[in-house]
Interface confidence: low
């Protein structure tokens, strides 16, 4: 006989990412004996909750909690039974719930209470359901990306920890209802609300972050739809040959389209809207989402929001990745430069509905919206955030790193479970992201 070394005991953590359009569950794992090492936590499994985001259950809070049951049942299988009681479970809601909380705080509270009631029924260590601020969403996305890519700290060949010289990566997240930009900066932010200071592994990071509510992909599409109805009577970003019935109540129910809402409109009225495949008019429509007329600081991104110049490399994930991936993979268009990205957007916007369907067989959901999405991403990066060709060369569009989805969820769990120490390795003390 010979001795067989047992694999190290694993610990688990669960995060429910309650986004505006859907909820995803992520289960993370890490070796119990290496809790404070970097790059040790990885994704064990994930599950997409069927149906819409929890904010869509404003009129039916119990429906929100019921929708989670399938994924929670999967979690019971994915996490070993003996680990259930010690597995932290978190639910974080983002911009969809932030919007609901602005328009109907009672409904938002009811949804969170219903969800909490269901989550406490499971044998996990439930640690709360809450709405993340835009700042938290941005910062935790940045932490996730840099943790996975081992930018905070590495174990050297000489057998000690060191801080990599390459510096941190900026993070850009395009969700359904908001978009976040976060990056390390050397100078203090002129706007206190846009700065977060972090202590990770004995290093100090000054991070600029801003979340633009109503600038997520879905809300942008709604706003463009409202603008098209208001100014054109046709949709320049939709392909010619594509036509659909638009329910006015759906268009104007979001607080993001409130400014475009007609004085007296029939919410149950349907309007027929057709596409016109007009890239130039589409670009103008998208441009209308950004205001550069005023800036109460030394410099701004858009809408009077302070932003230092973008610096260093960036990872762009979620809908940034899906949009660029569509252009690259489905359309076969190069997007290595800003000029190419703009040309790709124009190319998609020039396609008729028949051409688009022929080019992307297997009828992709929301195919008609890719022109607007591509045009928005291009404008947001170049005009909005101020990426020039050189800076854009440092942007990578990525969905996963180290087999783990890039998003705020991992960073959120790392923070709440104190898996990133504030002090250098050797000292075992937690960190506070407040």
């Amino acid at each position: 006989t010979r001795d067989v070394r047992e694999p190290p005991a694993l610990k688990y953590g669960i995060v429910l990412d309650a986004g505006s359009s859907h909820t995803s569950m992520f289960i993370y794992k890490w070796p119990a004996d290496k809790e404070n090492d970097t790059g040790i936590v990885g994704q064990h499994s994930s599950c997409d909750v069927p149906g819409g985001g929890i904010s869509s259950y404003a009129d039916n809070p119990s429906g929100a909690s019921q929708s989670l049951v399938g994924c929670l049942e999967q979690a019971l299988q994915d996490v070993p039974k003996e680990r259930h009681a010690g597995t932290p479970l978190y639910l974080g809601a983002t911009a969809g719930m932030r919007l609901l909380n602005l328009t109907n705080p009672e409904a938002s509270t009811s949804v969170l209470m219903a969800v909490t009631h269901t989550l406490t029924q499971y044998p996990f260590d439930f640690r709360g359901a809450r709405i993340l601020s835009g700042q938290e969403e941005g910062v935790f996305g940045w932490v996730t990306a840099n943790y996975l890519l081992e930018n905070f700290i590495k174990y050297g060949w000489v057998g000690r920890w060191f801080r990599p010289r390459k510096g941190t990566l900026g993070a850009m997240d395009l969700g359904g209802a908001s978009t976040q930009i976060t990056f390390e900066t050397t100078s203090p932010a002129e706007d206190r609300a846009s700065e977060v200071q972090l202590h990770l592994y004995g290093q100090h990071y000054r991070v600029y972050t801003h979340s633009f509510l109503c600038y997520g992909r879905d809300q942008v599409l709604q706003r463009l739809l409202a603008s098209a109805l208001q100014t054109h009577g046709f949709h320049p970003c939709w392909p010619r040959g594509f036509s659909t019935q638009v329910l006015l109540g759906d268009v104007y129910q979001s607080p993001c389209t409130m400014a475009q809402r007609p004085q007296n409109f029939n919410s149950s009225a349907r309007v027929s809207l057709s596409g016109s495949s007009d890239p130039h008019l589409c670009r103008d429509l998208v441009s209308g989402l950004f205001s550069f007329s005023s800036c109460p600081f030394s410099r701004c991104s858009f809408n009077g929001v302070f932003q230092p110049p973008v610096a260093g490399n960036f990872v762009a994930f979620s809908a940034f990745f899906y949009t660029v991936d569509f252009l690259r993979t489905s359309m076969g268009l190069p997007v290595a430069t800003l000029q190419q990205l703009e040309a790709a957007a124009v190319n998609v916007c020039n396609q008729t509905w028949a051409q688009l369907q022929a080019r992307v067989p297997g009828q992709r959901a929301r195919l008609a919206d890719y022109c607007a999405g591509a045009m928005f991403v291009q404008q947001l990066l170049s005009r909005g955030y101020g990426f020039d060709e050189r800076a854009f060369g440092g942007v990578i569009f990525q969905k996963k790193a180290a087999d783990t989805a890039v998003g705020w969820a991992l960073g959120y769990m790392l923070n709440l479970t104190n898996l990133i120490p504030a002090d250098p390795p050797g000292l075992r003390k937690g960190t506070d992201f407040s």
């Epitope: 979340s211 509510l213 109503c214 005023s294 109460p296 302070f306």
Partner: antibody, heavy 125, light 106 residues
Framework: EVQLQQFGAELVKPGTSVKISCKAS????????MDWVKQSHGKSLEWIGD????????TYNQRFKGKATLTVDKSSSTAYMELRSLTSEDTAVYYC??????????????????WGAGTTVTVSS | QIVLTQSPTIMSASLGEEITLTCSAS?????MHWYQQKSGTSPKLLIY???NLASGVPSRFSGSGSGTFYSLTISSVEAEDAADYYC?????????FGGGTKLEIK
């Protein structure tokens, strides 16, 4: 309760300087910029400038550059404004005001959500 | 700098009357704030970003407008509304205030 405490009045001679204070309480002092506003007798309001207490970053209305200097003492949660080379034109009520913000639609809407009671500066020989 | 012109300069209103104060900007601004200043006190935030009522402000106050023209409406004037009202823009540096409208109650 959020409060900005200012002291009543200062009588000063022309050509001299005066330093007026504004003590904040009821909130985290470094979380909000502090602005200063001038109101001459029977007249409107005029923005002088602001200071970010966290980093001592100041922004001034061009009209008050060289006239006003804004500082803070974080340990006592107090903001100061020094006015120099005083003339009768500087006779006015000076208010400190906390800069509130309402982040929405991707914008930050700034406004003055809390005001001090004002300090009356009278410049007279 | 952006000049804000308020009119009228002085307004006299009866109790229960609906009145509108206006503020015109020398060039387009994104939004407007309104402050109320009662005699001998400091200004108080009334309406922020054009139409949002500040905490504790009665619902008889409302604001609207866009571009270069903004207005403040009091739907039913009460005695306690006697004050100076200032509009304030935070769109363009330096931030400026209107000259004010004095509201007197008949």
């Amino acid at each position: 309760e959020v409060q900005l405490q200012q002291f009543g009045a200062e009588l000063v001679k022309p050509g001299t300087s005066v330093k007026i204070s504004c003590k904040a309480s009821g909130y985290t002092f470094t979380d909000y910029n502090m602005d200063w506003v001038k109101q001459s007798h029977g007249k409107s309001l005029e923005w002088i400038g602001d200071i970010n207490p966290n980093y001592d970053i100041t922004t001034y209305n061009q009209r008050f550059k060289g006239k006003a200097t804004l500082t803070v003492d974080k340990s006592s949660s107090t903001a100061y404004m020094e006015l120099r080379s005083l003339t009768s034109e500087d006779t006015a009520v000076y208010y400190c005001a906390r800069r509130g913000f309402f982040p929405y639609y991707g914008n930050s809407y700034y406004y003055f959500d809390v005001w001090g009671a004002g300090t009356t500066v009278t410049v007279s020989s | 700098q952006i000049v804000l012109t308020q009119s009228p300069t002085i307004m006299s209103a009866s109790l229960g009357e609906e009145i509108t104060l206006t503020c015109s900007a020398s060039s387009s601004v994104s939004y407007m704030h309104w402050y109320q200043q009662k005699s001998g006190t400091s200004p108080k935030l009334l309406i922020y970003s054009t139409s949002n009522l500040a905490s504790g402000v009665p619902s008889r106050f409302s604001g609207s407008g866009s571009g270069t023209f903004y207005s403040l409406t009091i739907s039913s004037v009460e005695a306690e509304d006697a004050a100076d009202y200032y509009c304030h823009q935070w769109s363009n540096y330096p931030w400026t205030f209107g000259g004010g409208t004095k509201l007197e109650i008949k």
